[in-house]
């Protein structure tokens, strides 16, 4: 903590401006009024404060707002956001996408995945659901950030919003997240024709159940091996040799390349050798 001292009269601060960069930590602590700082937060980011000085300013705000900063302050945090911990952010109530955009821009290039994930979580909570505007903002300013949300938060995505999600936005999603997103995607794309449907649903297939994979095999989709390798092991295991053959089409030969890797390995071990032999790939169960 910064030691408390009295502010020298000549150092008294009446507005947040560039003169403050010459203040020592102790002087900032003594001379900057927290309420003034909060009221003029929009000026802070234009001033080249050192990280030490930013620590003091953060401390000021923490004292003024022990229950969490108001959005009027959060929106203008700028580089002060880099000083925030996930615990700090958890206290916030954020509803504005302008606030989200501003802070996502600041965080770019910094190792702040935990803070960004918490921020996005607070935005979703604040807005009540993961609506289209929020998803659009995330995909534009933070590709991959969608997957930082918990399955519980993702469950608030309406199916109508799924169309805004791009394949690269799902690259870092885990199985539990795809389990939540896949049924929404299936619903969102259900009226599309076979080939168009597959293009749209493919990034979400890591959450597909066995029955849907079997059904896909009826649509001549010729699934690529990269997509097949991302399928849930439990969903792949019950597929028959004929179903995998039909699902992969000409890509079935790729099973040989992947035969030592899950889920292919596990699937091979579950099949009768006679059935595997019909593929003519030399797969050994």
């Amino acid at each position: 903590d910064v030691e408390r001292t009295t502010c020298p009269p000549e150092k008294e601060v009446h507005e947040i401006d560039e003169n403050l960069i010459f203040y020592k930590k102790r002087e900032l602590e003594a001379c900057v009024d927290a309420a003034l700082l909060a009221a003029q937060m929009d000026r802070v980011d234009a001033i080249p404060f050192t990280y030490e000085q930013l620590d003091v300013l953060k401390h000021k705000l923490d004292e003024l707002y022990p229950q969490g900063y108001p959005e009027s302050v959060i929106r203008h945090l700028g580089h002060l956001f880099l000083k925030m911990s996930p615990e700090d952010i958890r206290k916030w109530n954020v509803t504005s996408l302008e606030t989200l955009k501003a802070l996502l821009k600041v965080s770019k290039g910094h190792e702040m995945s935990a803070q960004v994930a918490t921020l996005i979580d607070r935005v979703v909570v604040g807005r009540g659901q993961l609506d289209k505007d929020t998803v659009d903002t995330l995909t534009a300013f933070c590709p991959g950030c969608l997957c930082s949300l918990s399955p519980e938060r993702l469950s608030s995505v309406p199916p109508s919003v799924i169309g805004a999600v791009r394949p690269q936005d799902l690259d870092t999603c885990g199985p539990r997240q795809l389990d939540v997103l896949y049924p929404k995607a299936r619903l969102a794309f259900q009226n599309m024709s076979g080939s168009e449907y597959f293009v749209k649903i493919r990034p979400f297939l890591g959450g597909a159940p066995t029955e849907d994979l079997k059904a896909l095999s009826q649509q001549n989709v010729s699934m690529d091996l990269a997509t097949f390798m991302k399928l849930r092991r439990e969903a792949v295991l019950p597929l028959t040799v004929a179903e995998v053959q039909k699902l992969l089409g000409p890509h079935v030969e790729g099973l040989k390349v992947e035969e030592q890797h899950s889920p292919v390995r596990d699937w091979i071990l579950k099949q009768r050798q006679d059935d595997l032999d019909t593929l003519g790939l030399g797969l050994q169960g």
Partner: antibody, heavy 117, light 107 residues
């Protein structure tokens, strides 16, 4: 050993309804798509309907779409075909068949449906 | 829909003969072509799937070949129990369709 036994066939008047059943044994019924295939007297084979292993997806040719409904009860290992608005041209032996990916690998003995006034 | 046309519609042959039945698809079906055998009053039985793979328990005198649109079922040495009707079926695209059948009779 895979066994499929159809029942429920019989004589029905045009416009009438009939429900066929197929009792399956010898394999894990809930793992497989199932189908109905029919054969008019002295004619060839015609695929009638297919249902996914969990019952979510159903497929029909245009000739029966809207009139026939395929369903299943996995707890009873039973496949069904509800046939409504029957026509004379629906007269056939109806076979229940297990469907694997792109072929019908096991068939029941069939049940005859006659549509006549 | 994909049309499947078999030829001949019927043929007469003797035990020990080599028999060939052809099946033509109206469009490319890759190798998703299956053959079934049906005896009078009985259900069809799967013989060959994916053009040339023998279903379990099917004798090796049965073989299949082809790809794309033209396919062949061959019985290398006809046996008494082989007199039956044979159907091809495409499994490439819904609706799945069958050929009209080829009846193999005793000469």
């Amino acid at each position: 050993e895979v066994q499929l036994v159809e029942s429920g066939g019989g004589l029905v008047q045009p416009g009438g309804s009939l429900r066929l059943s197929c009792a399956a044994s010898g394999f894990t019924f809930s793992d497989y798509f199932m189908s109905w295939v029919r054969q008019a007297p002295g004619k060839g084979l015609e695929w009638v309907a297919t249902i996914s292993n969990g019952g979510t997806y159903t497929y029909y040719p245009d000739s029966v779409k809207g009139r026939f409904t395929i369903s299943r009860d996995n707890s009873k290992n039973t496949l069904y075909l509800q046939m409504n608005s029957l026509r004379a041209e629906d007269t056939a032996v109806y076979y229940c068949a297990r469907f694997d990916g792109y072929y019908f690998d096991y068939w029941g003995q069939g049940t005859l449906v006659t549509v006549s006034s | 829909d994909i049309q499947m046309t078999q030829s001949p519609s019927s043929l007469s042959a003797s035990v020990g003969d080599r028999v060939t039945i052809t099946c033509r698809a109206s469009q490319d079906i890759s190798n998703y072509l299956n053959w079934y055998q049906q005896k009078p009053g009985k259900a069809p039985k799967l013989l060959i799937y994916y053009t040339s793979r023998l279903h379990s328990g099917v004798p090796s005198r049965f073989s299949g070949s082809g790809s794309g649109t033209d396919f062949t079922l061959t019985i290398s040495s006809l046996q008494p129990e082989d007199f039956a009707t044979y159907y091809c079926q495409q499994g490439n695209t819904l609706p799945y369709t069958f050929g009209q059948g080829t009846k193999v009779e005793i000469k």
